[in-house]
Amino acid sequence: MMTGTIETTGNISAEKGGSIILQCHLSSTTAQVTQVNWEQQDQLLAICNADLGWHISPSFKDRVAPGPGLGLTLQSLTVNDTGEYFCIYHTYPDGTYTGRIFLEVLESSVAEHGARFQIP
């Protein structure tokens, strides 16, 4: 039975040209995390593997950085970065847990962070 929950940074906004940290955290399970995938819609941004470390997709290499922890830092944001981001936790023996973050990139200086929320 999958007992874990993923807490994410929720709905967040940031200014064009700035940077943002995407973070997820898996709790309430003793399952071992073997890999975390970060995806934007259907595109793979990055993989963090417990044995092999990080792999950043070549198309994002110049503006995606690993960390903090299993999180991801996006830099030089454009309005095209607006959309859904997913953290996919591959665990043993539970299986896969997925968290969702919605990022809005704003032209103006009205950028506010949303509250954290949980996805069962």
């Epitope: 955290h25 417990a50 995606v64 903090p68």
Partner: antibody
Framework: QAYLQQSGAELVRSGASVKMSCKAS????????LHWIKQTPGQGLKWIGY????????NYNQKFKGKATLTADTSSSTAYMQINSLTSEDSAVYFC??????????WGQGTSVTVSS | QIVLTQSPVIMSASPGEKVTMTCSAT?????MHWYQQKSGTSPKRWIY???KLASGVPIRFSGSGSGTSYSLTISSMEAEDAATYYC?????????FGAGTKLELK
Amino acid sequence: QAYLQQSGAELVRSGASVKMSCKASGYTFTSYNLHWIKQTPGQGLKWIGYIYPGNGYTNYNQKFKGKATLTADTSSSTAYMQINSLTSEDSAVYFCAREGGWAMDYWGQGTSVTVSS
Amino acid sequence: QIVLTQSPVIMSASPGEKVTMTCSATSSVSSMHWYQQKSGTSPKRWIYDTSKLASGVPIRFSGSGSGTSYSLTISSMEAEDAATYYCQQWSSNPSTFGAGTKLELK
């Protein structure tokens, strides 16, 4: 097996700068963050910042911005930290440590820096 | 920045005794890491992601906690456990460490 070999102890004059190295082996250098930590007897462990050698991204603790500069040479799998305008406050042991999402799992042996007036 | 306060600062335990040390954060963090350091050596990753034991760490060690309160427990103290233990968070920048708990053998 990952291994981090740090450069030897340094005795430097106040006001000068120092550049220390951390040579990585046994793993893919460009796949892990490389952190730098300062340790003094009275202050414990202080996080300076990290570099991701995969693209050269750096993230500094604001308290060390302008004081420390982190770089990496992927051809030799070596990370560097330069500390400038040294004062007695900078006398410490400096560690490099590897991190790949699951805390700092391998640490160098440390580089001792002594600042003399 | 998030400040981590470890307590006690120093403690001693007899062989076989249960030991608990705590790490309190000024703001909620998603997980905590713990490192063991013996005099004259580098820190070693000991417990990561709150409760996972690093490779080679004896199962008498355990970690727990959430939010602002975390702890490291040794079910039965052994001589080789005498060391300083540091907690660390990286839920938010900058990453911070606690000042350490020095555990001595009684």
